[in-house]
C-alpha cells in the first residue's frame, strides 16, 4: 500500500491503485521506436531491440508494429496506453501476455500490430496462426 508520507497528487496518472490501494508497477517493454527489420515470412521474430524501458505510466502496455512496403520492413517497439488508439487502431489485445500480431488495413503497405502486458513481451512477436485464438480448435483447448 502507499505509505502516508508519499503525497497524493490531484491529477496523477503516473500511479495506478486498485480498490485495496495496491500499487501497479509499470510495465517493462522493448522501446526502440522504429527500426529497420529483417523479420519476414517467419512464424515469430525477436525484436533485436537492446533497450528495455520502464513505461512512463503504469497503465501502459508493450506494443510492436511490423510494417512492410515496396522499399523496406520496419519494426516499431514502444509503450502505449491501451485506452488510447495507436496508429488509429485500438489495442484490443492489451491484456495478452504474448504479442500476437494481427493484420490491420493500411493502404500501400502490409501492417501488423500487437500489444501485450508482460515484461518485455514485445521482444518476441508472433505471427503464427497456432497462437491465434480465433482458431476454434485452440478455443476448445483453452476452455476445456
Amino acid at each position: 500500500t502507499i505509505p502516508p508520507h508519499v503525497q497524493k497528487s490531484v491529477n496523477n496518472d503516473m500511479i495506478v491503485t486498485d480498490n485495496n490501494g495496491a500499487v501497479k508497477f509499470p510495465q517493462l517493454c522493448k522501446f526502440c521506436d522504429v527500426r529497420f527489420s529483417t523479420c519476414d515470412n517467419q512464424k515469430s521474430c525477436m525484436s533485436n531491440c537492446s533497450i528495455t524501458s520502464i513505461c512512463e505510466k503504469p497503465q501502459e502496455v508493450c506494443v510492436a508494429v511490423w510494417r512492410k512496403n515496396d522499399e523496406n520492413i520496419t519494426l516499431e517497439t514502444v509503450c502505449h496506453d491501451p485506452k488510447l488508439p495507436y496508429h488509429d487502431f485500438i489495442l484490443e489485445d492489451a491484456a495478452s501476455p504474448k504479442c500476437i500480431m494481427k493484420e490491420k488495413k493500411k493502404p500501400g503497405e502490409t501492417f501488423f500490430m500487437c500489444s501485450c502486458s508482460s515484461d518485455e513481451c514485445n521482444d518476441n512477436i508472433i505471427f503464427s496462426e497456432e497462437y491465434n485464438t480465433s482458431n476454434p480448435d485452440l478455443l476448445l483447448v483453452i476452455f476445456q
Epitope: 500500500t1 495496491a22 500499487v23 501497479k24 508497477f25 510495465q27 502486458s117 508482460s118
Partner: nanobody
C-alpha cells in the same frame, strides 16, 4: 518488518552529480527487484529505474537513460542510484521500493514497503 532508508540527497547545481543510497534491513534483500521512484513537487510518482536481484539486470525510464545508473550490493543489502548531468526537472523526493516476487506478468504487485525518501534539489 522490512525497513528501507534512503540517503544522499541534497542541493546540487545543474550538470552536477549525486549518489543516493538505500539501506535495507529486516528482509531477504536478494529476493526482490528494487526500484528508485521519484515524486516532484505537486506531481505524480515517476518510476526512474529498477534492478533485478540476480544478474543485476537494469532498467531505466527514458527520461534518465544515459544519465543515471542503478546498482546494488547484495552483501551490504544496499541499493544505489548514481545521478549525473542533473537537470532542474530531476528535482524530487526519491524513494526506494522493493517489488515483491510473483508472476512476471501479473503487473499488480504491491509496493509493499517504501523508504521515507530523500530530497534532491537541482538549482543554481
Amino acid at each position: 518488518e522490512v525497513q528501507l532508508l534512503e540517503s544522499g540527497g541534497g542541493l546540487v547545481q545543474p550538470g552536477g552529480s549525486l549518489r543516493l543510497s538505500c539501506a535495507a534491513s529486516g528482509s531477504t534483500f536478494t529476493e526482490y527487484r528494487m526500484w528508485w521512484v521519484r515524486q516532484a513537487p505537486g506531481k505524480g510518482l515517476e518510476w526512474v529505474s529498477a534492478i533485478e536481484p540476480i544478474g543485476h539486470r537494469t532498467y531505466y525510464a527514458n527520461s534518465v537513460r544515459g544519465r543515471f545508473t542503478i546498482s546494488r550490493d547484495n552483501s551490504k543489502n544496499t541499493l544505489y542510484l548514481q545521478m549525473n548531468s542533473l537537470r532542474a526537472e530531476d528535482t524530487a523526493v526519491y524513494y526506494c521500493a522493493k517489488q515483491a516476487p510473483g508472476e512476471k506478468w501479473a503487473r499488480r504487485w504491491d509496493l509493499d514497503y517504501w523508504g521515507q525518501g530523500t530530497l534532491v534539489t537541482v538549482s543554481s
